[in-house]
Interface confidence: low
């Protein structure tokens, strides 16, 4: 049979902690599309038991042979059928787990029923919350049978299925009429293709006699061993907390396999791990019972004691399932020379010994560096050796050093020294670093300096909204990679902490210091469009735009105008910091340049969609500056300006522009057009008496040219006349004192 196990964690008080893990012991299982074959699949099967839609479940792959399903948010998410598919080609196998709600009206006395062809199957639904209505039995989602509510026997509704055949296999349910399907009792019936003890195409071959509750596979005759047992006939017990065809897997968590349901390939079905029983696999076996679901009885002989995980533990000189078989200087076997554990853990150390008389649990002891002697808490007795398991008290740093395993029997004694290294779990010394942020995600560099011992095996990032009392969200990341925290709230501060782990049980260090990381604003979604633009000079452009009208407040802090000069390959960006603005003056542009122009809304650091672009051609630059500008006061209100035309003109001058400003004044300058470009002088009238003025001027062809030098002159005092002739031009007159 394929080595495939589906584990369900039955911590039902908190669905968010519930998880399903599919573990494959097959070589190269789950590596995907390479030569090793197809990956492991783990999914909820909604074909028969449908539950209300909820948030999608999270699937996490841990290496090549393990996949875990999490993300259950409410108890109803758990109810139903889950399946794991693994193995390649003809060995592709589906393992099924059926989950019942602990609060259902009806509960199955036993969820998985494996029966032989021709047997009578009896499904028993126990009344948990009574309703005085009929009970509907369904098979694979279809109506099968109805029982009147009076037909309950001893608080149970029974469905008898005589002479079952393989097509009868499937999911059965018992539901009160008009009750929620989630309150049903769900069962799984597995009908072997052969009668008891037989296998093969015509059921002609005899099964090997599977021990410890193993089930003979009707296709290949192999024993599908219960969790915690191994061997061709399931004759050998694994160490406590181990499972898989070679006992190679270990139950997660500090409670071993407590609270875990194990599902194996058909025809085994599901059960608790060895040593546990009950609907939630949280009850230890009663004395004298052992194995999966505690279904086996020890019946130990010759002074053997019953271990709920492995069965009979035989005294010296005896072995066999019931210590019924009678059996040199003792010898320590296969002791590792060096072991490593984490500080404050309580590891189990195994020491195996053989000899005649056969070593028993009490004859093997473990000695710590300080001389303390530990006695084993459990022993697994096999025909050729006894393996004593020692539960070491919580390790401290002083426990580092040489330990010794010693076996003593009446035949003599043997000992073996080995080195134990106690390592300190790593603790971050700094907070994680924020790399980039968006409105709904943060990219974080999690690896920081730490105290304690490496190597770092896993990095956990814990995060939650600042000042929140909600549970921390946790993400396990590769130590060498940056991590993206997804599905966050915009514009929200998050407290983020790192927890580092080193290899081995108890390798998780304390949480590092928190840091505050804030998500960005929501992205602005409105697309502006350009209403128009107006050239206000060879280097000046006024732009106006609009936004679509939408209900609600505007999401935006301002606008970004972008001008692209394709000839020079240069981009100019202008920030308009008011979201109410709809116009902007762009200055300092390059005359005679063809620009591509667009505008977009921004919010915090995020840009919205850009408007459709506009193409704008600025006029070329104007003429050089007029030469030799000179000013002379004519009266208390008039000053005459004279100049020479600019040299090297690119074309005919259309006008001159004079700038007039009171010296030291705070007001804006006044511009006056001189519309007769052939003139080289003009009189500025309407000035104030005894006032000092500044003048400069420039010429215009297609665009305004460079400014001339600035000249100063004062108007005369009242009643004084300047000497010499007066030459007037038709310059526009305007008083500066209005």
């Amino acid at each position: 049979a394929v080595d495939l196990t589906l584990l369900a964690n039955l911590r039902l008080t908190d669905p968010q902690r519930f998880f399903l893990t599919c573990v494959s012991g097959e070589a190269g299982a789950g590596r995907g599309s390479d030569a090793w074959g197809p990956p492991l699949l783990l999914e909820k099967d909604d074909r028969i038991v449908r539950t209300p839609p909820g948030p999608p479940l999270r699937l996490a792959r841990n290496g090549s042979h393990q996949v875990t399903l999490r993300g259950f948010s409410k108890p109803s998410d758990l109810v139903g059928v889950f399946s794991c598919v693994g193995g390649a080609g003809a060995r592709r196998t589906r393992v099924i787990y059926v989950h019942n709600s602990p609060g259902a009206h009806l509960l199955p006395d036993k969820v998985t029923h494996t029966v032989n062809k021709g047997d009578t199957a009896v499904l028993s639904a126990r009344v948990h919350k009574e309703k005085q209505t009929d009970v509907i039995w369904k098979s694979n989602g279809s109506y099968f049978y109805t029982l009147d509510w009076h037909e309950a026997q001893d608080g149970r509704f029974l469905l008898q299925l005589p002479n079952v055949q393989p097509p009868s296999s499937g999911i059965y349910s018992a539901t009160y009429l008009e009750a929620s399907p989630l309150g049903s009792a769900f069962f799984r019936l597995i009908v072997r293709g052969c009668g008891a003890g037989r296998w093969g195409p015509g059921c002609t071959k005899e099964c090997p006699g599977c021990l410890h509750g193993g089930v003979c596979h009707d296709h290949d005759g192999e024993c599908v061993c219960p969790p915690g047992f191994t061997g061709t006939r399931c004759e050998q017990a694994c160490r406590e907390g181990r499972f898989g065809q070679s006992c190679q897997e270990q139950c997660p968590g500090i409670s071993g396999c407590r609270g875990l349901t194990f599902c194996l390939p058909d025809p085994y079905g599901c059960s608790c791990g060895s040593g546990w029983r009950g609907s939630q696999c949280q009850e230890a076996c009663a004395p004298g019972h052992f194995g999966a679901d505690c279904r086996l009885q020890c019946q130990c002989q010759n002074g053997g004691t019953c271990d709920r995980f492995s069965g009979c533990v035989c005294p010296s000189g005896w072995h066999g399932v019931h210590c019924e078989k009678s059996d040199r200087i003792p010898q320590i076997l296969n002791m590792a020379s060096e072991l490593e554990f984490n500080l404050e853990t309580m590891p189990r150390i195994n020491c195996a010994a053989a000899g005649n008389p056969f070593p028993v649990r009490g004859s093997i002891e473990l000695r710590k560096p300080d001389g303390t002697v530990l006695l084993s808490t459990k022993a697994i007795v096999e025909p050729e050796k006894t393996t004593a398991e020692f539960e070491v008290p919580r390790l401290v740093l002083a426990d580092s050093g040489f330990w010794e395993c010693r076996v003593s029997t009446s035949g003599g004694q043997d000992s073996r020294r080995f080195k134990v290294n106690v390592k300190v779990p790593p603790v971050p010394l700094a907070a994680p670093r924020l790399l980039t942020k968006q409105s709904r995600q943060l990219v974080v560099s999690p690896l920081v300096s730490f105290s304690g011992d490496g190597p770092i095996s896993t990095v956990r990032l814990h995060y939650r909204p600042q000042d929140s009392t909600m549970d921390w969200s946790t993400i396990v990341v590769d130590p060498s990679e940056n991590v993206t925290l997804m599905n966050l709230r915009p514009k929200t501060g998050y407290s983020v902490r790192v927890q580092l782990s080193r290899p081995g049980e108890g390798g998780e260090g304390a949480w590092g210091p928190p840091t505050l990381m804030t998500t960005d604003c929501p992205e602005p979604l409105l697309q502006p469009w350009l209403e128009g633009w107006h050239v206000e000079g060879t280097d000046r452009l006024r732009v106006s735009w609009s936004l679509p009208l939408v209900p609600g407040p505007l999401v935006g802090d301002g606008f970004l105008l972008r001008l692209w000069d394709g000839t020079r390959g240069q981009e100019r960006r202008e920030n308009v910091s008011s979201p109410q603005a709809r116009t902007a003056l762009l200055t300092g542009l390059t005359p005679g340049t063809h620009y591509q122009l667009d505008v977009q809304l921004y919010h915090c650091t995020l840009l919205g969609p850009a408007s459709p672009p506009a193409h704008v051609l600025l006029p070329p630059s104007g003429p050089p500056a007029p030469r030799h500008l000179h000013a002379q006061a004519l009266s208390d209100s008039e000053i005459q300006l004279t100049w020479k035309h600019p040299e090297a003109l690119p074309g005919p001058i259309s006008k001159y522009v004079v700038e007039v400003q009171v010296a030291g004044g705070a007001g804006d300058p006044l511009w006056i057009d001189v519309d007769r470009p052939e003139e080289t002088s003009t009189i500025i009238r309407g000035l104030n008496a005894s006032t000092r003025y500044l003048f400069r001027m420039r010429a215009s062809i297609q665009g305004l040219g460079d400014w001339s030098n600035t000249v100063e002159e004062s108007t005369l005092g009242n009643g004084l006349q300047a000497e010499g002739p007066v030459q007037e031009s038709r310059a526009a007159e305007e008083g500066l004192d209005q």
């Epitope: 911590r11 908190d14 919580r394």
Partner: antibody
Framework: EVQLLESGGGLVQPGGSLRLSCAAS????????MMWVRQAPGKGLEWVSR????????QYADSVKGRFTISRDNSKNTLYLQMNSLRAEDTAVYYC??????????WGQGTMVTVSS | QSELTQPPSASGTPGQRVTISCSGS????????VNWYQQLPGTAPKVVIH???QRPSGVPDRFSGSKSGTSASLAISGLQSEDEADYYC???????????FGGGTKLTVL
């Protein structure tokens, strides 16, 4: 005889500082996780801080984080609690305790800290 | 506010059996062993039960502890006057990354 003896308590004004000591004897001090636990007058027990045998790892309750510092001197078999920025709500009997598999098997007799103006 | 919940008081007559409950969460009692402390008036606490049901040497066998799921209880049979004290439950809390104490139960021997 295995025992723990606290000292250093007293009356201090809000915002002030105190340093508590806990002298250990009768066991290998350097091998154990040590704790400080406090009990406000008429109230229940509250964990304050915890330190690993080497002193390299420390843990604090949220209520004292950033204000209190736990430390140890294994050569002197002594545990310390440096308390800064004291508040009225820090008024309590402070016990040191030995932590064995997260059970506190040995306790000192306690030292009273009163924060009042 | 305590992370573990205990009744504030309990009482019984000499010779009676009394039980004190302690309720926690999946991250505290659900995952970790429970310890019980006795605090006689004016003295430091003393552990009477550790690791759910283990009695330290010197503690009478009248004291017993048990745990189921996210709850635990301390039972005292054959109640005696010297048992009058405050009793606190405690368990490591994985979400706090520290120990959590119950608020305490004052046991009165009538």
């Amino acid at each position: 005889e295995v025992q723990l003896l606290e000292s250093g308590g007293g009356l201090v004004q809000p915002g002030g500082s105190l340093r508590l000591s806990c002298a250990a004897s009768g066991f290998t001090f350097s091998s154990y996780v040590m704790m400080w636990v406090r009990q406000a007058p008429g109230k229940g027990l509250e964990w304050v801080s915890r330190i690993y045998p080497s002193g390299g790892i420390t843990q604090y309750a949220d209520s004292v984080k950033g204000r209190f510092t736990i430390s140890r001197d294994n050569s002197k078999n002594t545990l310390y609690l440096q308390m800064n920025s004291l508040r009225a709500e820090d008024t309590a009997v402070y016990y040191c305790a030995r932590d064995v598999y997260r059970a506190f098997d040995i306790w000192g007799q306690g030292t009273m800290v009163t924060v009042s103006s | 506010q305590s992370e573990l919940t205990q009744p504030p008081s309990a009482s019984g007559t000499p010779g009676q059996r009394v039980t004190i409950s302690c309720s926690g969460s999946s991250s505290s009692i659900g995952l970790n062993p429970v310890n019980w402390y006795q605090q006689l008036p004016g003295t430091a606490p003393k552990v009477v039960i550790h690791s759910n049901d283990q009695r330290p040497s010197g503690v009478p066998d009248r004291f017993s502890g048990s745990k189921s799921g996210t709850s635990a209880s301390l039972a005292i049979s054959g109640l005696q006057s010297e048992d009058e004290a405050d009793y606190y439950c405690a368990a490591w809390d994985d979400s706090l990354n520290g120990p959590a104490f119950g608020g305490g139960t004052k046991l009165t021997v009538l």
